[in-house]
Each structure stands twice: as structure tokens, then as C-alpha cells.
Amino acid sequence: SAGAGSHCQKTSLRVNFEDIGWDSWIIAPKEYEAYECKGGCFFPLADDVTPTKHAIVQTLVHLKFPTKVGKACCVPTKLSPISVLYKDDMGVPTLKYHYEGMSVAECGCR
Amino acid sequence: SAGAGSHCQKTSLRVNFEDIGWDSWIIAPKEYEAYECKGGCFFPLADDVTPTKHAIVQTLVHLKFPTKVGKACCVPTKLSPISVLYKDDMGVPTLKYHYEGMSVAECGCR
């Protein structure tokens, strides 16, 4: 698993809707793979973390002034939808094929 | 200034090109305002940090399992260009009006 010492990468994060209180309106699935972006954005930033110019600059400044400026952060840079069965306002079970932005597709340094 | 205890916000970060070794090709300006995104992504995530659904989910999971899952991260969500004077292959000073992605326009929780 990706700890603080490892490079920015996508790791598993199973989310149970009951744990976050969303089971009141999401009927199914009971849980889903959300993924999580974990790990550090270390110098030099690799191409696979698709760094912006600002992230590159911040990384270089952090290298020179580590106490003054933080590293870039490993975050989702592309998200995917999931399909959910939910209750609408009338309590009717309705399928939303593309509930956007729920699962990490790619991680990067920002 | 925005510390770890404050909410995610844009703070000043003056970057000197000499400090990061870019003065070899960027002639001017000598320094610029890059800004930095600092502060925490605390529950509940406010609208001004424009959270994605995944960031909201991760924040809720962190609330329940703080040691297992990290908080969302405060990062640049919109970047602005700067203008730079650089030397081309022939050594001719050339102005690039829009050197993209160099300065933070907006921060958010991701």
C-alpha cells in the first residue's frame, strides 16, 4: 500500500454508503470502489503524475525552502462515474447510470 | 497566513527564478507571484473550495476512519499564465505572453 514514503499513486478505497450516511438515499450498491490518491510528490516529479508547471515550481521551491513551502499534493486529476440506484423525491427507485465524479480514474501532483 | 489549522485558501508565494535554477533560460521577470494553496479541507467542505463528489466522500470517510483515510487536499484548481522573456534557440530574447499554468487563480479541495 502507498504510504507517506511512497510516490503518488492510486490506491484502493472501498466506501460503504452506510458508513457515510448516504444509505438513506442510495439503495444500491451498498459499497463501491472510490479509490484514493496516496503518496508523496517528490522531486523530480515523474511524467506519470502529470505535474502542472505550478506543481513543478512549487516542488523546486520546497526543495530550496522546505520549511517555508509545502510539497505539491497527490490528488485525483481525473474522476469516473458510478451507477447508483437511488430514491427520487417521490421515493421512486431510479437508476442513475452516470453519477459523476465518484471514483478516481487518475492521480497526479498538484 | 494560512497554516494547517486554517481553511483551504490562496496565499502569497513569491518565486525567484534564480532560486529554482530557471534564470538560465527565463531572462525576466526575475521573480513572480505564483501563490500557494494552503490550509485544511475540513468537514463540512464549503462551496468556495468547490469540492468534487469524491472529495466530499473522502472527507466523510476520513471523519469516520481518520487513521485509515486522509483528508482531501487543498490544491490549485485553476491556474493563470504569466508573461516571460526567454532566449530562443538562436539566443534571441523573445516574449511569451502566455506561459500557461504558472500562477494559482483558485484553490479547492480535491
Epitope: - | 531572462i27 525576466a28 521577470p29 526575475k30 521573480e31 513572480y32 504569466i82 508573461s83 516571460v84 522573456l85 530562443d88 538562436m90 534571441v92 530574447p93 523573445t94 516574449l95
Partner: antibody
Framework: EVKLEESRGGLVQPGGSMKLSCVAS????????MNWVRQSPEKGLEWVAH??????????HYAESVRGRFTISRDDSKSSVFLQMNNLRAEDTGIYYC??????????WGQGTLVTVSA | DIVLTQSPASLAVSLGQRATISCRAS??????????MNWFQQKPGQPPKLLIY???NQGSGVPARFSGSGSGTDFSLNIHPMEEDDTAMYFC?????????FGGGTKLEIK
Amino acid sequence: EVKLEESRGGLVQPGGSMKLSCVASGFTFSNYWMNWVRQSPEKGLEWVAHIRLKSDNYATHYAESVRGRFTISRDDSKSSVFLQMNNLRAEDTGIYYCTGGSNYVFAFWGQGTLVTVSA
Amino acid sequence: DIVLTQSPASLAVSLGQRATISCRASESVDNYGISFMNWFQQKPGQPPKLLIYAASNQGSGVPARFSGSGSGTDFSLNIHPMEEDDTAMYFCQQSKEVPWTFGGGTKLEIK
């Protein structure tokens, strides 16, 4: 070695026309703005016109004193820039330099060619 | 148009001494943290040659005795130590706005 070579100028009567040309070598011509700058004892150094790149749709700009009378053009395939001068006046007399450069500076200069407008 | 006023119009300096030429713009030639000010040297019968760009950066092959400074509206060119080869006309030039304009020039001679 960078070289800019202007065509021979000469004497022309007021109201007359002349076309100057300039051939470049030693650099990638199509990557640079091309300009004409003139010099006279009365007016000193004076930018006349420039033509930008293909990516800028070969946009042109002129000094107010020559607008409507002079036309700058370029042929990237021949690494050449031209200045068509019409309705010439006595105050257009001077040494005409072909210069190449960026959107920031006149980097390369020709040796210049003398244009004399006189009856 | 941005008007550039150079002073003095002519200057005689002893060999080994410092020559200072000033250029004042009718409005600021700075933008984006960049000074759009250049200096050219011209010797008789030759085209101008780029000496200094962006106020303080030396052109290619320019000796270290040539230096530039300033920002906004006030700029200067320094030559130290003065050498015989430095006898020439010197022009400031701005590229912030079209039309790009030149100063009237300063004639530098040896005293």
C-alpha cells in the same frame, strides 16, 4: 553566420515608387518577425514597419508616417522580406535597414541601403 | 507614441573612466515585471548592434564593461572602463508598444 542583404536603393523622384527586398540566411527565417528601420540625420533611427509570422496570419504594422503608402510583405520559401514604397516624399530619404527579430527586439540587422527622394 | 529622451547628446570620456548615458521614457516601459528597454551601439558605416536588452542583460558577445540598469521610465547605460573601441553612437529603444521607438542617440568620444 546570420546575414541580411538589402537590395540596392537609389534615387527616386518625389511621388515615385521603389521596392526594396532583403534576403536572409543563417537562421530559420519563418520563425522571426521581419522589420524595416530607417535612419536619417533629421529623424535618427525610425522603425518603419514589421510583418509577423504565418501563425499570426502575417500581421503587419506600420509607422504613422508611412501608413497607406508603404507595404511590407514576406516570402518564407525564399527567406525574403520586401518593402513596397509608393508616393515617396523627401522626408522618406534615409538608410533603410532590414532587421529580423522577435516580438521583443531587433536582433539581426542588414548593412542598410540608401534611398534618396529628390527632384 | 512613447518618446525616449537621451542625455547627454554627446559625451567625451577618458580611457579607463566611466561613461554613463541616460534614457528617459515619456511613460513606463515596464510590463509583466519586464522592462521593454534595449540599448544599441552604432559605429560609422555600420548597422546598430544590440548591446543590452531588457534593461540590464548583455547581448551575445558584448563585453562585461557594458552594463545597463533602470526600470519604469528611467534607464542608464554604463561603460567602464572606457576603451578606444567604444567610440560610437548609442541609442536606447523601447519595444513595449508599437511603434517601437528609439532615443535620439548619444555620441561617445574619447577625451
